[in-house]
Interface confidence: medium
């Protein structure tokens, strides 16, 4: 076996190495002793865009001429690891994720450009890149240190309909307020003009051409 403990037998995983606090160091120090370990590099931190999109590069040092590669993105939050997405591709071809996958990606040599979409604040976590060289034998496995993806939910934009309602309400309020103000002012003004008399509005004949329809009322005091 060219790579002790990292060879796949039939469908069963014949696996040989476990990972925890210091174990990453254990991997890096001891795997080379009994296996040409495949190193996987990925950025330490990535900030998702306001639209919930995060992109990072996963680069692996291929020990051989692999033709079939499988890339898996694992998310670790708290203590639990879950598979986010996975794609198998033939060297030189595009990565094909499932239709409903939140991941997309492109490959270029030993580099895979991964994009994860639809992220929310609750999706913040460590995203680990796992690369498997499936064919030809021997089978190789490499696991990156993980990329901490931070997702900050944008301030929610108010609904445009809601904004229109607010605008309409404010406009109506201002209109009625100005109407009321005008009425009050006018009544005060009238009271000042003739404190002891009453009066009527009389429609006078037009002074300008009929077509303009501008009727101007005059105040005629009645004794």
């Amino acid at each position: 076996m060219a790579c002790l403990g990292f060879q796949r037998h039939k469908a069963q995983l014949n696996l040989a190495t476990r990972t925890w606090p210091c174990t990453l160091l254990f991997f890096l120090l001891f795997i080379p002793v009994f296996c040409k370990a495949m190193h996987v590099a990925q950025p330490a931190v990535v900030l998702a865009s306001s639209r919930g999109i995060a992109s990072f590069v996963c680069e692996y040092a291929s020990p051989g001429k692999a033709t079939e590669v499988r890339v898996t993105v694992l998310r670790q939050a708290d203590s639990q690891v879950t598979e986010v997405c996975a794609a198998t591709y033939m060297m030189g071809n595009e990565l094909t994720f499932l239709d409903d996958s939140i991941c997309t990606g492109t490959s270029s040599g030993n580099q895979v450009n991964l994009t994860i979409q639809g992220l929310r604040a609750m999706d913040t976590g460590l995203y680990i890149c796992k690369v498997e060289l499936m064919y030809p034998p021997p089978y190789y496995l490499g696991i990156g240190n993980g990329t901490q993806i931070y997702v900050i939910d944008p301030e929610p934009c108010p609904d445009s309909d809601f904004l229109l309602w607010i605008l309409a309400a404010v406009s109506s309020g201002l209109f009625f307020y100005s109407f009321l103000l005008t009425a009050v002012s006018l009544s005060k003004m009238l009271k000042k003009r003739s404190p002891l008399t009453t009066g009527v509005y009389v429609k006078m004949p037009p002074t300008e051409p009929e077509c303009e329809k501008q009727f101007q009322p005059y105040f005629i005091p009645i004794n």
């Epitope: 995983l13 190495t17 476990r18 606090p21 174990t23 254990f26 639990q80 690891v81």
Partner: antibody, heavy 124, light 107 residues
Framework: QMQLVQSGAEVKKPGASVKVSCKAS????????ISWVRQAPGQGLEWMGG????????NYAQKFQGRVTITADESTSTAYMELSSLRSEDTAVYYC?????????????????WGQGTMVTVSS | DIVMTQSPSTLSASVGDRVTITCRAS??????LAWYQQKPGKAPQLLIY???NLQSGVPSRFSGSGSVTEFSLTISSLLPEDFATYYC?????????FGQGTKVEIK
């Protein structure tokens, strides 16, 4: 709450191999590490190795390197521990235990859930 | 490998006693230490993780302290069900190693 159920007791002859299974139920099996710990009669606890099914990786204590193989079958949520070239001193109770650990940060809670144990007797 | 040494090996105590078990690591393990309780014929049960954190469901009479190489487990007031064997375990560096155990027996 996850539970770990192990296979029954085994009696083996020196030089033979034994394969003990550990089936998980009530939890996400592949997301956690499963370790194997043994305890010889009247003795203390000894860690043999462990596996993280979703990572597809495991490691072994140097003492057992080359004699132990730990595998996992995600489809049946079962972990296996195979010990070969058995000797009389391998007579022990073999436990599988769930570990909660963090790949990068070191947040970790040791072995929080254990199987009931499998007695393996090596005798000629 | 990191060697874990527990003391005492056996401890005789009475119900209601305050009991302390110590565990020493052969090199620094920071706070990566767990304590387990094991009763005859049963699997161990996690009591304390990361030196001083009480595992969910474990009574508050159990407490852990210490760091670097010196650690201790204290049972504030022994109950009849606390008579068992206690193990410490480091998980700072693989392989994970256990202490040889401390048997708490009835005086």
């Amino acid at each position: 709450q996850m539970q770990l159920v192990q296979s029954g007791a085994e009696v083996k002859k020196p030089g033979a191999s034994v394969k003990v299974s550990c089936k998980a139920s009530g939890g996400t099996f592949s997301s956690y590490a499963i370790s194997w710990v043994r305890q010889a009669p009247g003795q203390g606890l000894e860690w043999m190795g462990g596996i993280i099914p979703i990572f597809g990786t495991a490691n072994y204590a140097q003492k057992f390197q080359g004699r132990v193989t730990i595998t996992a079958d995600e489809s049946t949520s079962t972990a296996y521990m195979e010990l070969s070239s058995l000797r009389s001193e391998d007579t022990a109770v073999y436990y599988c235990a769930r570990e909660i650990g963090s790949y990068s940060s070191g947040w970790y809670r040791a072995f929080d859930i254990w199987g009931q144990g499998t007695m393996v007797t090596v005798s000629s | 490998d990191i060697v874990m040494t527990q003391s005492p090996s056996t401890l005789s105590a009475s119900v209601g006693d305050r009991v302390t078990i110590t565990c020493r690591a052969s090199q620094s393990i920071s706070s990566w230490l767990a304590w387990y309780q094991q009763k005859p014929g049963k699997a161990p049960q996690l009591l304390i993780y990361k030196a001083s954190n009480l595992q969910s469901g474990v009574p508050s009479r159990f407490s852990g302290s210490g760091s670097v190489t010196e650690f201790s487990l204290t049972i504030s007031s022994l109950l009849p069900e606390d008579f068992a064997t206690y193990y410490c375990q480091q998980y700072s560096r693989p392989p994970w190693t256990f202490g040889q155990g401390t048997k708490v027996e009835i005086k």
